[in-house]
Interface confidence: medium
C-alpha cells in the first residue's frame, strides 16, 4: 500500500473523520490539504486499496493571484446506503512530484439492528411430517441470537445450542405460522412470517379389490391429515401404452387421464367405462380444506378379458346334397378380448345337437348323414375369447342349394368324413 514519505511535511490539514451507523445510512468523509502550485488529484483508499469507482467530489480554492501560489483542496467521499462492504479504514492519497502522501485514517463502522440474510419461507408439508426452516441474521454488533416463534409463541431453545439457524419441526397437525427474531445489543429485528400449510399425507396401499372387463374397483388407505378431515379423494386412470411403463415418480403421462372423485369414507371407488383386456395405470390423491396430498405412484392394473358382446354376423348356411356350406363374419360388437375362435352348433328336427369348434376360420363344410334327409336343419355360431363364449347367433335354417345359386366366393374347407352327430359336447 502507498506510504507517505517523511522527506517533506504532509500537505494534509484535515483528515477523514469516523462514521458509525446502521445499514442504509448515508455519510460523507472529508479531507483537506494545502499545496503550492497546481493542485493534485486526491485519491481515496479503503484498507490501503485505491477506490477506483469512488463517489467523490474535489473542490479547489486558490489562496493567491498566481498559479504558483497555495491552493486549498477539499475532497469529499460520499457513502450512500451503508453496507458491511463499506466498512474499513479510509485515507486520502496524493502524488506531489515524486512523493506520495497519505492522510491520517478515518474509520467507517456498521452497527445497528440485526440484518436478515435468510428468512423462513412459506411452504406446504404433509401432516405429521418433519421439516426444517432456516433463518440467518448478522450484526454488527455481534453476537446475534435467534429466537423462533410458532403462531406468535416463542419456542424455547435448548441452552448452549446458541442461535438456531435451522429449526427442525418434527411435524404439524395444523397450518401454522413461523417467524424468527434476531437479537443483538442494539435491539431486536423480526423476520417475515412464513405460513406452513398442512396437507394430507399421501395415501398408501392403493390396490385392486375386484376386476371386471369394463370396470375396476380400487381401494386405498388414507394418510393422516391433521385436524382437517378429508373432503374427498381423486383417482386418475390413464391408458398405458405398450411399453410406456409409467415409472414411480416419473412425470405425468402424455394422455389425458380419466379422473373420478370419491366421497370419503369409504376409501374405495368403482371405475367404470373402461376398455376390456386393457392395461391402465392408476393413482390417487386425497384433499382436505387445506389442499390436496401428493399423488401416489402410478400403479399398473389391467382389466380382464370379457366374452364377445355380440354374435357373428351375416351367417349363411346352404345345403347341396349331403353337404352343407356355412360361413359368417366376425361380430361387429366388441370382442372384449382376443378372439380365439368360433363354435358352431347344428341340429335337425329329430336329431341331437352337434357342437363343433371351428377355430379362427369363418367357414365350414359339413358332411350330412346318409341321403341328406335331415329335415329342418338349423345352424348357430358363437365367437369366443379366453373368458368364454359370446352370445349365440339366432338359428339359421339350412337352405337347399338351387342350380344357378352362387356358391360362396371364398374357399370352403371340407371337414373330414366322420359319422354324423359324433361331435363331443363342449
Amino acid at each position: 500500500a502507498p506510504r507517505g514519505t517523511q522527506a517533506e511535511e504532509s500537505p494534509f490539514v484535515g483528515n477523514p473523520g469516523n462514521i458509525t451507523g446502521a445499514r442504509g445510512l448515508t455519510g460523507t468523509l472529508r479531507c483537506q490539504l494545502q499545496v503550492q502550485g497546481e493542485p493534485p488529484e486526491v485519491h481515496w483508499l479503503r484498507d490501503g486499496q485505491i477506490l477506483e469507482l469512488a463517489d467523490s467530489t474535489q473542490t479547489q480554492v486558490p489562496l493567491g493571484e498566481d498559479e504558483q501560489d497555495d491552493w486549498i483542496v477539499v475532497s469529499q467521499l460520499r457513502i450512500t446506503s451503508l453496507q458491511l462492504s463499506d466498512t474499513g479504514q479510509y485515507q486520502c492519497l496524493v502524488f506531489l512530484g515524486h512523493q506520495t502522501f497519505v492522510s491520517q485514517p478515518g474509520y467507517v463502522g456498521l452497527e445497528g439492528l440485526p440484518y436478515f440474510l435468510e428468512e423462513p419461507e412459506d411452504r406446504t408439508v404433509a401432516a405429521n411430517t418433519p421439516f426444517n426452516l432456516s433463518c440467518q441474521a448478522q450484526g454488527p454488533p455481534e453476537p446475534v441470537d435467534l429466537l423462533w416463534l410458532q403462531d406468535a409463541v416463542p419456542l424455547a431453545t435448548a441452552p448452549g445450542h446458541g442461535p438456531q439457524r435451522s429449526l427442525h419441526v418434527p411435524g404439524l397437525n395444523k397450518t401454522s405460522s413461523f417467524s424468527c427474531e434476531a437479537h443483538n445489543a442494539k435491539g431486536v429485528t423480526t423476520s417475515r412470517t412464513a405460513t406452513i400449510t398442512v396437507l394430507p399425507q399421501q395415501p398408501r396401499n392403493l390396490h385392486l379389490v375386484s376386476r371386471q372387463p369394463t370396470e375396476l374397483e380400487v381401494a386405498w388407505t388414507p394418510g393422516l391429515s391433521g385436524i382437517y378431515p378429508l373432503t374427498h379423494c381423486t383417482l386418475q386412470a390413464v391408458l398405458s401404452d405398450d411399453g410406456m411403463g409409467i415409472q414411480a415418480g416419473e412425470p405425468d403421462p402424455p394422455e389425458e387421464p380419466l379422473t373420478s372423485q370419491a366421497s370419503v369414507p369409504p376409501h374405495q371407488l368403482r371405475l367404470g367405462s373402461l376398455h376390456p383386456h386393457t392395461p391402465y395405470h392408476i393413482r390417487v390423491a386425497c384433499t382436505s380444506s387445506q389442499g390436496p396430498s401428493s399423488w401416489t405412484h402410478w400403479l399398473p392394473v389391467e382389466t380382464p378379458e370379457g366374452v364377445p358382446l355380440g354374435p357373428p354376423e351375416n351367417i349363411s348356411a346352404t345345403r347341396n346334397g349331403s353337404q352343407a356350406f356355412v360361413h359368417w363374419q366376425e361380430p361387429r360388437a366388441p370382442l372384449q378380448g382376443t378372439l380365439l375362435g368360433y363354435r358352431l352348433a347344428y341340429q335337425g328336427q329329430d336329431t341331437p345337437e352337434v357342437l363343433m369348434d371351428i377355430g379362427l376360420r369363418q367357414e365350414v363344410t359339413l358332411e350330412l348323414q346318409g341321403d341328406g334327409s335331415v329335415s329342418n336343419l338349423t345352424v348357430c355360431v358363437a365367437a369366443y375369447t379366453a373368458a368364454g363364449d359370446g352370445p349365440w347367433s339366432l338359428p339359421v335354417p339350412l337352405e337347399a342349394w338351387r342350380p344357378g345359386q352362387a356358391q360362396p366366393v371364398h374357399q370352403l374347407v371340407k371337414e373330414p368324413s366322420t359319422p354324423a352327430f359324433s361331435w363331443p359336447w363342449w
Epitope: L149, D151, A152, V153, P154, S179, E181, V188, T190, T193
Partner: nanobody
Framework: QVKLEESGGGLAQAGGSLRLSCAAS????????IGWFRQAPGKQRELVAA???????NYADSVKGRFTISRDNAKNTVYLQMNNLKPEDTAIYYC????????????WGQGTQVTVSS
C-alpha cells in the same frame, strides 16, 4: 403503548424459591404472548418461559419441572414461580410481551436481578 414492570427478584439460597411478577399497563388488550428472558453475565439472552392467551406454555429445557409461568388476566400480571433454584439461574430476568396483529410489536421490562448462592 405497553409498559412492563418486573418485581420479585433478589437473593436466594440454592434449592430455594422466588416468585417474579410482571405487571402490564397501557394498551394491554393488544398483548397476545408474554414471557420471561434472562441474561447471565457474559452470556446471550435466553428465553426462560412464555405463555400465550390460550393454554400454550413453553419452557427452556434447563428450567422444565422447576419453573412455572402463570397469568392473572384480571390483574394484568404474569408470574414466574422459580423452585429448586440453582446457582446457574443467577441472571437479570426480563419480562417481554408480543403484541397481536404484528409480531414485531415488542415490549420489554427493565429487568430484575436474581442471585442464587450456593
Amino acid at each position: 403503548q405497553v409498559k412492563l414492570e418486573e418485581s420479585g427478584g433478589g437473593l436466594a439460597q440454592a434449592g430455594g424459591s422466588l416468585r417474579l411478577s410482571c405487571a402490564a399497563s397501557g394498551s394491554i388488550s393488544s398483548i397476545n404472548t408474554i414471557g420471561w428472558f434472562r441474561q447471565a453475565p457474559g452470556k446471550q439472552r435466553e428465553l426462560v418461559a412464555a405463555s400465550d392467551s390460550g393454554a400454550n406454555r413453553n419452557y427452556a429445557d434447563s428450567v422444565k419441572g422447576r419453573f412455572t409461568i402463570s397469568r392473572d388476566n384480571a390483574k394484568n400480571t404474569v408470574y414466574l414461580q422459580m423452585n429448586n433454584l440453582k446457582p446457574e439461574d443467577t441472571a437479570i430476568y426480563y419480562c417481554r410481551a408480543w403484541g397481536t396483529g404484528t409480531i414485531s410489536t415488542m415490549y420489554w421490562g427493565q429487568g430484575t436481578q436474581v442471585t442464587v448462592s450456593s
